[in-house]
Interface confidence: medium
């Protein structure tokens, strides 16, 4: 299944309501408005695939379609990270990868997409209706998350068709900077368009499959209620999840990801901002001014960091870009 957050569709002005201004006069404002909406709306896609060879083995692929520099990717299951979801893997461009069972292999596929293979055996194996979520933290867009799952009727070996229920979330800390300025500009542009008496207010019509209306909705205060509208988490079969996930995770083990930030609009003030924080029993992303600390609950890794090189035969340098140039 490939669930993609759609850019809101713009409804063009009705031909009968052209008014005093000629059609060409409106081209620039509409182009600007289109750019505003699309530029302010990074997209995250999630694809969940059940392998034909191993019926209980899953491959989750996630990608970020924004233009910013990705500073952290978190993959979770059972719901969004911080909303009852349990972390499967954390990928950081400089510090590396950490993963926990049943994750078998997490890897960067490109500069902006990752994949995760899940083990298909034992109590911790996923099942078809499990929800998998990918959260991308980037600068300047902030933090964006999308979720997806395989419908129970999916044929093994096939990706499910796009579902209409991805979660797309921007953490406030990440978008109040550059994205906030962009949003203000877009709102102002809308205001200018409204002032033309002979023009109806431009209608922003969300795409049918999009949970996200105009940009402002992305950081609506009630993220939990937003999420509830989009993904029916009540249908998750919790028996597919390991029982150990509901218990407090032991401390110790890999240290770096417990205090990993996602990129916020504000730079950390100094080393103190990155001091390790107590690890809660459940995974959560805590938004603070200096950054977003990944506080997914620590568990003893079964397979350790699942580190696999970029698939390009030329090696990592083939992935040159904002993160990869030596």
């Amino acid at each position: 299944m490939r669930t993609e957050a759609q850019v809101p569709a713009l409804q063009p002005p009705e031909p009968g309501l052209e008014g005093a201004m000629g059609h060409r006069t409106l081209v620039l404002p509409w182009v600007l408005l289109t750019l505003c909406v699309t530029a302010g709306t990074p997209e995250v896609w999630v694809q969940v695939r059940m392998e034909a060879t191993e019926l209980s083995s899953f491959t989750i692929r996630c990608g970020f379609l924004g233009s910013g520099s990705i500073s952290l990717v978190t993959v979770s299951w059972g719901g969004p990270n911080g909303a009852g979801g349990t972390t499967l893997a954390v990928l950081h461009p400089e510090r590396g990868i950490r993963q926990w069972a049943p994750a078998r292999q997490a890897r960067w596929e490109t500069q902006s997409s990752i994949s995760l293979i899940l083990e298909g055996s034992g109590a911790s194996s996923p099942c078809a209706n499990t929800t998998f979520c990918c959260k991308f933290a980037s600068f300047p867009e902030g933090s964006w998350e999308a979720c997806g799952s395989l419908p129970p009727s999916s044929d093994p070996g096939l990706s499910a068709p796009p579902t209409p229920a991805p979660i797309l979330r921007a953490d406030l800390a990440g978008i109040l900077g550059v994205s906030g300025v962009l949003l203000f500009g877009c709102v102002y542009l809308l205001h200018l368009l409204r002032r033309h008496k002979h023009r109806p207010a431009p209608r922003l019509q969300p795409s049918r499959t999009s949970p996200q209306a105009p940009r402002a909705r992305a950081w609506a205060p009630s993220q939990a209620s937003q999420a509830a509208l989009h993904v029916p988490y009540a249908t998750i079969n919790t028996s597919c999840r390991p029982a150990t996930l509901d218990t407090a995770h032991p401390h110790g083990g890999p240290s770096w990801w417990a205090s990993l930030p996602t990129h916020a609009a504000h730079r950390p003030q100094g080393p103190a901002a990155w001091a390790s924080t107590p690890i809660p029993a459940r995974g959560s992303f805590v938004s603070v001014e200096n950054g977003l600390y990944a506080q997914a609950g620590e568990r003893p890794p079964h397979t350790g960091p699942g580190l696999t090189l970029f698939p390009d035969p030329r090696g990592p340098r083939a992935m040159e870009g904002p993160l990869g140039v030596r």
């Epitope: 510090r95 590396g96 990155w274 140039v325 030596r326």
Partner: antibody, heavy 122, light 106 residues
Amino acid sequence: EVQLVESGGGLVQPGRSLRLSCTASGFTFGDYAMSWFRQAPGKGLEWVGFIGSKAYGGTTEYTASVKGRFTISRDGSKSIAYLQMNSLKTEDTAVYYCARGPRRYTYGMDVWGQGTTVTVSS
Amino acid sequence: DIQMTQSPSSLSASVGDRVTITCRASQSISSYLNWYQQKPGKAPKLLIYAASSLQSGVPSRFSGSGSGTDFTLTISSLQPEDFATYYCQQSSTPLTFGGGTKVEIK
């Protein structure tokens, strides 16, 4: 030419402090994480810690044995990385190296300084 | 932390010999392993990154292989300047090194 030059090493008493500098040249300093390593006499290499690149907010991380005592920082305007060492112990005696990277964690540390010797002794 | 175990700790070889050094990780690190060469009184030099990618400027007689937990550094034909100590290092923080393999002249 891409180059790293360490300085600031010397003889210091246990419990005292010392600050090492790593001056970078020949590359865009802010684009790279900077790492510190050490090597005790006749021993192998040990990672001390690192400070992330500008793109990742300059986050720091340390090996367990120095956490709380050592602090890594960077001055982008001067292209210098620092290793502030407090509460020094005799077991901190080593040659300290700074290294460029990792730019991405898969790449390794591709440029190293010549090293500076720190001797902690009473 | 991930432990890296190198073997042998030392070996004696002659110019022209094929030399193989192994490194084992305490848990899977996929292909994220680097190899360094260090000569007495000098800083380490990166030879191989990501298990098998040759660092720019490093002679092609050096090669790396392996994935998961077992890795190998091979010098196809040992040259006089290759007598040194070699270290493996895994790439996710906290970074850890193998104990080193000293290649000496037979």
